[in-house]
């Protein structure tokens, strides 16, 4: 999307609404770079493949992202 | 009650600038993408600009690129919009309005919560 | 630059009946990126649609919304009276980035 911007971050706004893991497609955990100063946290929901952006310092996002790790740490051999 | 209140509207000289702002209340307004969008007098919405959650995102439309300045300050839930050389178009009502929770540039929620609106005239 | 065309221009209908209103766009747009808008003369619009067809908190089932590439549809599914009022679709995307219809007035016949 052609947003006349100066840096290239991803995110409008951010939720600090919890997120069931259960409902996640996929999350995906963008670190600062040249072009966005900041963590960019964007979680995919399963339902209408919707993308939400999430708050990195909200207490509720710091958990799952604990969560979604411990599982991918469970899964991985 | 989440509330969002425009103020700075008056009457102005075309050639002149006029500052609006708009005062959040009732919610963490670092945490949200915002926007001004603009009525003319019998006419239907017209967006003008809008700014990311940390202020680096900022887009305008074609029609004030180059004129309106767009800004905010998190410490003071403030969003503002500078307007220099005012036209006689440039005459409407200017809303603020906050962009959904967790908008992106691959989704949109949409504006859900919009100001009552400050009117702008632009007249000699 | 994507157009946004509504129709039609304004809509006759009776309590009780049920309303389509059509948005079309110049380019297709992602299903993502399309939003309907309710305003009521002197009062600010309120967000009724965003993702084209996912409703806003608060906002009654019989409001629902359709479509994809350059066809949306609003529907009303039995219009109350305070359902008088205009509506608008809404693209983000394209420069310039947020574009709005121009909009359909719902009145009493």
């Known amino acids: 999307i052609p947003l006349s911007r100066t840096v290239r971050c991803t995110c409008i706004s951010i939720s600090n609404q919890p997120v069931n893991p259960r409902s996640l497609e996929k999350l995906e955990i963008i670190p600062p770079s040249q072009f966005c100063p900041h963590v960019e946290i964007i979680a995919t929901m399963k339902k209408k493949g919707e993308k939400r952006c999430l708050n990195p310092e909200s207490k509720a996002i710091k958990n799952l992202l604990k969560a979604v790790s411990k599982e991918r740490s469970k899964r991985s051999p | 009650q989440v509330q969002l209140v425009e103020s700075g509207g008056g009457v102005v000289q075309p050639g002149r600038s006029l500052r609006l702002s708009c005062t959040a209340s009732g919610f963490t307004f670092s945490d949200y993408g915002m926007h001004w969008v603009r009525q003319a007098p019998g006419k239907g919405l017209e967006w003008v600009a809008v700014i990311g959650y940390g202020g680096l995102i900022k887009g305008y439309a074609d029609s004030v690129k180059g004129r309106f300045t767009i800004s905010r300050d998190n410490s003071k839930n403030t969003l503002y919009l500078q307007m220099n050389s005012l036209r006689a178009e440039d005459t409407a009502v200017y809303y603020c309005a906050r962009e959904g929770a967790g908008s992106s540039v691959y989704y949109y929620y949409g504006m859900d919560v919009w100001g009552q609106g400050t009117t702008v005239t632009v007249s000699s | 630059e994507i157009v946004l065309t509504q129709s039609p221009g304004t809509l006759s209908l009776s309590p009780g009946e049920r309303a389509t209103l059509s948005c079309r766009a110049s380019?297709?747009?992602?299903?993502?990126?399309l939003a309907w808008y309710q305003q009521k003369p002197g009062q600010a619009p309120r967000l009724l649609i965003y993702g084209a067809s996912s409703r806003a908190t608060g906002i009654p089932d019989r409001f629902s919304g359709s479509g994809s590439g350059t066809d949306f549809t609003l529907t009303i599914s039995r219009l109350e009276p305070e359902d008088f009022a205009v509506y608008y679709c809404?693209?983000?995307?394209?420069?310039?980035?947020?574009?709005f219809g121009p909009g359909t007035k719902v009145d009493i016949k």
């Open positions: 380019q297709s747009v992602s299903s993502s990126y």
């Open positions: 809404q693209q983000y995307g394209s420069s310039p980035i947020f574009t």
